[in-house]
Amino acid sequence: TLNSVLINSNAIKNLPPPLGGAGGQPGSAVSVAPGVLYEGGNKYQTLDNYQPYPCAEDEECGTDEYCSSPSRGAAGVGGVQICLACRKRRKRCMRHAMCCPGNYCKNGICMPSDHSHLPRGEIEEGIIENLGNDHGAGDGYPRRTTLTSKIYHTKGQEGSVCLRSSDCATGLCCARHFWSKICKPVLKEGQVCTKHRRKGSHGLEIFQRCYCGEGLACRIQKDHHQTSNSSRLHTCQRH
């Protein structure tokens, strides 16, 4: 069905055309599947194109940035949003993603996130580290997530909400599912994977796959011949 093609294959979806094409501009609505409407900015800008970097969510920005309207501190406010430099310790904040790595937002102020001072179950937000196309469930560069998880002494199991792959138990990675990020199994040899054509092209990402496991790389399946280059099947293969 069209549904399964668009959002139910285990891959990050690249639905609208790149920036400059016929796709929606920031703030437009994009239909991702029959019966579903996704509204958000165009997520196809690359790292090395023009500045400032447009965004719809914190997760589209770099490690030391958050997504916001230039004149406002909070994301989600009307107008075009761009990636802004993160806020250092003791600066005002409205959410964890606004604070620089190693800090979190408490009572409107960026504080050092020394876990020893956080009570068990305290909610803390961090950064998802994507190590590259073969080692990240996303676009191949570090980015923030606006979602959170609770700090537990045990690692997240399959289906647990997470911030980063290190929150998940061995053999799992942190990847998007619907409007959350959860722990999912790392891919094994022969399983279908997602290889992005260029940095930054992470599409709508309603569903993300994990990266390929150790010793594996996401490559075009040799016996998979298709007329369209863009629809070539990638699988996890031995180096």
Partner: antibody
């Protein structure tokens, strides 16, 4: 303690509008995706809308163009603006979130809407 | 959309006995190595409460009496031993595909 408290329900005529609110506390609201789910008088549960922490919004066809989900991350409130209401929109409306796993593990008590002339 | 069919629509079980509710999906809800099937309990005048997620994992504070099983398109919720307090409606729900959908519900009564 996590709390979700809905308000704004009531009786409205077909074609009318209504805005629901969901006040959240006990967690860092701005970092979590939020959803609205409704339950019809026949007890059928239906997903109505969701919004990510960054403000991206998602709707099923049944409410697309009529309902708008939004959030105020300063006041910790989730909204559902409903317009062009129909009799089939009559339901108990719940706000829900996923704090520990992908499923909706925290729900409010709900607010009732009746669309009738 | 994925359609979930629950059976039976209602059942009455004696105190201490086993109650089993079935949920069949119109297509597999397995993806990413996870079965995206959840179970909720709803008592009169209350919102739904998450019992089981990922087919068999228990939600926070859910007693071990509630067990979920199954994969693909066939799932079940088992309550054993059944207690008086378990009188409620039980719903299955899939989170594999957008839109998330719910089963029609099963009404459990304790004899």
């Amino acid at each position: 303690e996590v709390k979700l408290v809905e308000s704004g329900g009531g009786l409205v005529k077909p074609g009318g509008s209504l805005k629901l609110s969901c006040a959240a506390s006990g967690f860092t609201f701005s970092n979590y995706a939020m959803s609205w789910v409704r339950q019809t008088p026949e007890k059928r549960l239906e997903w109505v809308a969701s919004i990510s922490g960054g403000g991206d919004t998602y709707y099923p066809d049944s409410v697309k163009g009529r309902f708008t989900i939004s959030r105020d991350n300063v006041r910790n409130i989730l909204y559902l603006q409903m317009s062009s209401l129909r009799s089939e929109d009559t339901a108990m409306y719940y706000c829900a979130t996923s704090l520990e796993n992908y499923a909706m593990d925290y729900w409010g008590q709900g607010t009732s809407i009746t669309v009738s002339s | 959309d994925i359609v979930l069919t629950q059976s039976p629509a209602s059942l009455a079980v004696s105190l201490g006995q086993r109650a089993t509710i079935s949920c069949r999906a119109s297509e597999s809800v397995d993806d990413f190595g996870i079965s995206f099937m959840n179970w909720f309990q709803q008592k009169p005048g209350q919102p739904p409460k998450l019992l089981i997620y990922a087919a068999s994992k228990q939600g926070s504070g859910v007693p071990a009496r509630f067990r979920g099983s199954g994969s693909g398109s066939d799932f079940s919720l088992t309550i054993h031993p059944v207690e008086e307090d378990d009188t409620a409606m039980y719903f299955c729900q899939q989170s594999k595909e957008v839109p998330p959908t719910f089963g029609g519900g099963t009404k459990l009564e304790i004899k």
